[in-house]
Interface confidence: low
């Protein structure tokens, strides 16, 4: 008997080929021997099946003694013995149709879990492979999880069912919705404008939702909600903002917003979070900020920096085209005394400058200026 | 007493420019937003947008964006509208408004978009040829 | 944009009697996070700036008569006069705050009958 194995909502074809090259009477019938379409001369006559409106044939192979089944839209309640009735003889086709479908929606927050059904007729043993978009192999049986998904395991998933040693493919698109992104840092100097973005991995054509922005000071006991904001179709509308500091909004993707101006007060962590409509669970990136300030007071040459910086972090301050006077993985470094010229604030990670502050010593008869 | 004394009318040619003035006192200045709102003879109130005196941080609707710009003075606590290539229908009472204080902060501390509480005597601005 | 819509246009209402106003927003400005509906009414006299009445719905200004009341949520709010006296002959405004653009009613004139 041969199989022949289908995909839930495609079309199959079962041939059945008769000795003499030319159009004879044939019948298609299922197990229980209810006719399912055949000929009468050249016309196609279609018996009390259920396939009844999504069953035809190929009338233009009968003249070479070719007589197709084509089922159309197959459910999983087609499978079934198929027999097909020729010049005396009976040829048996078994059709398993398979269905593959992801747990809820093929779009997914970064960190949900995807999960795949099998939907098999009874009887039927089948074994699935999936390899997802970056490579990875996944085995199962009725289904198959994947949990904590990641920003690469957007796209096409192309997974095999194999049963009879017969195989069918099944292709299914997922999105996972992320940020770019899962974390930024932004170094500035005390008083320069601040911009973050939050680039999304993903497009779909309406988004909507609700975000917001809580902010981690470094200085301050307990975070604080920046900024609160809805999207609908891709536009964003400020809901509430803080008075201080007072955010500012881009009104389309990608996500932007601006900080008038870096403060010490303002250095810490933030994290925003967008909560799409009818998902659940939220998208997160985590921004940084680090302020930088260059000061002298009397005798005292300073740079500080605020914010989350790494151990491995170097703060420096050295005379312009000088070596570094002082260089230390502190927060905080300054300088007794400091001779008259430029002086540079150095905030360094394995020798790459990640920021940098000017401040001009002037003869100790003078103010110091800030350039 | 907490108020809002605003620049006198102005009469202006279509295409020409027109600044309005909105001088604060009373409070503290920098502390709550200024809003800017129009009415036109016989018509309604129109929210054309707002600044914050404390970092001069604006937000005005999209219908104005690209003619209107708002500044402040901190120095004379003096809040300003510039309204460029002026037409017909732009002849209107000019008023700016400050946003409800700091008693109406909802109880975690958080500012949000607010009532007006204090509106300035209003400008009149009439454009014609 | 938050559309407001006010009715009716004009009223004419006895001294002493009650006026009601409407307004209706065309999306919810209930707050879900602190409960408060982001509406507030303004009284405007001829010649004169608007005056704040009430603000978060149903909260009266200090100074502003407690003839004067705010209800509703959501998107469906009502200004009542309890019994009209004659210096509340004016045009009255709804306004949401919940979102920018800060959107206006059309206003309704409040007359004596």
């Known amino acids: 008997k041969k199989v022949v194995l289908g995909k839930k909502g495609d079309t199959v074809e079962l041939t059945c080929t008769a000795s003499q090259k030319k159009s004879i009477q044939f019948h298609w019938k299922n197990s229980n021997q209810i006719k399912i379409l055949g000929n009468q001369g050249s016309f196609l006559t279609k018996g009390p099946s259920k396939l009844n409106d999504r069953a035809d044939s190929r009338r233009s192979l009968w003249d070479q003694g070719n007589f197709p089944l084509i089922i159309k839209n197959l459910k999983i309640e087609d499978s079934d013995t198929y027999i097909c009735e020729v010049e005396d003889q009976k040829e048996e086709v078994q059709l398993l149709v398979f269905g593959l479908t992801a747990n809820s929606d093929t779009h997914l927050l970064q960190g949900q879990s995807l999960t795949l059904t099998l939907e098999s007729p009874p009887g039927s043993s089948p074994s699935v492979q999936c390899r997802s978009p970056r490579g990875k192999n996944i085995q199962g049986g009725k289904t198959l999880s994947v949990s904590q998904l990641e920003l690469q395991d957007s796209g096409t998933w192309t997974c095999t069912v194999l049963q009879n040693q017969k195989k069918v493919e099944f292709k299914i698109d997922i999105v996972v919705l992320a940020f770019q992104k899962a974390s930024s840092i932004v170094y500035k100097k005390e008083g320069e404008q601040v911009e973050f973005s939050f680039p999304l991995a993903f497009t779909v054509e309406k988004l909507t939702g609700s975000g917001e922005l809580w902010w981690q000071a470094e200085r301050a006991s307990s975070s604080k909600s920046w900024i609160t904001f809805d999207l609908k179709n891709k536009e964003v509308s400020v809901k509430r903002v803080t008075q201080d500091p007072k955010l500012q909004m881009g009104k389309k993707l990608p996500l932007h917003l601006t900080l008038p101006q870096a403060l010490p007060q303002y250095a810490g962590s933030g994290n925003l979070t967008l909560a799409l409509e009818a998902k659940t669970g939220k998208l997160h990136q985590e921004v940084n900020l680090v302020v930088m300030r260059a000061t002298q007071l009397q005798k005292n040459l300073t740079c500080e920096v605020w914010g989350p910086t790494s151990p491995k972090l170097m703060l420096s301050l050295k005379l312009e085209n000088k070596e570094a006077k002082v260089s230390k993985r502190e927060k905080a470094v300054w300088v007794l005394n400091p001779e008259a010229g430029m002086w540079q604030c150095l905030l360094s990670d394995s020798g790459q400058v990640l920021l940098e502050s000017n401040i001009k010593v002037l003869p100790t008869w003078s103010t110091p200026v800030q350039p | 007493q907490v108020q809002l004394v605003q620049s006198g009318a102005e009469v202006k040619k279509p295409g020409a420019s027109v600044k309005v003035s909105c001088k604060a006192s009373g409070y503290t200045f920098t502390s709550y937003d200024i809003n800017w709102v129009r009415q036109a003879p016989g018509q309604g109130l129109e929210w054309m947008g707002r600044?914050?005196?404390?970092?001069?941080?604006?937000d005005y609707a999209h219908k104005f964006q690209g003619r209107v710009t708002m500044t402040r003075d901190t120095s004379t606590s003096t809040v300003y509208m510039e309204l460029s290539s002026l037409r017909s229908e732009d002849t209107a009472v000019y008023y700016c408004a400050r946003e409800t204080p700091s008693d109406y902060y909802d109880s975690s501390g958080y500012y949000y978009n607010d009532a007006f509480d204090i509106w300035g005597q209003g400008t009149t601005v009439t454009v014609s040829s | 944009d938050i559309v407001m819509t006010q009715s009716p246009d004009s009223l004419a209402v006895s001294l002493g009697e009650r006026a009601t106003i409407n307004c209706k927003s065309s999306?919810?400005?209930?707050?879900?996070?602190?409960?408060?509906?982001?509406l507030a009414w303004y009284q405007q006299k001829p010649g004169q700036p608007p005056k704040l009445l009430i603000y978060?719905?149903?909260t009266r200004e200090s100074g502003v008569p407690d003839r004067f009341s705010g209800s509703g949520s959501g998107t469906d709010f009502t200004l009542t006069i309890s019994s009209l006296q004659a210096e509340d002959v004016a045009v009255y405004y709804c306004?949401?705050?919940?979102?920018?653009?800060?959107?206006f009613g059309g206003g309704t004139k409040v007359e004596i009958k």
């Open positions: 999306q919810s400005v209930l707050y879900s996070s602190n409960n408060k509906n982001y």
């Open positions: 978060w719905a149903s």
């Open positions: 600044i914050n005196p404390g970092t001069g941080g604006t």
């Open positions: 306004q949401q705050y919940y979102s920018t653009p800060l959107t």
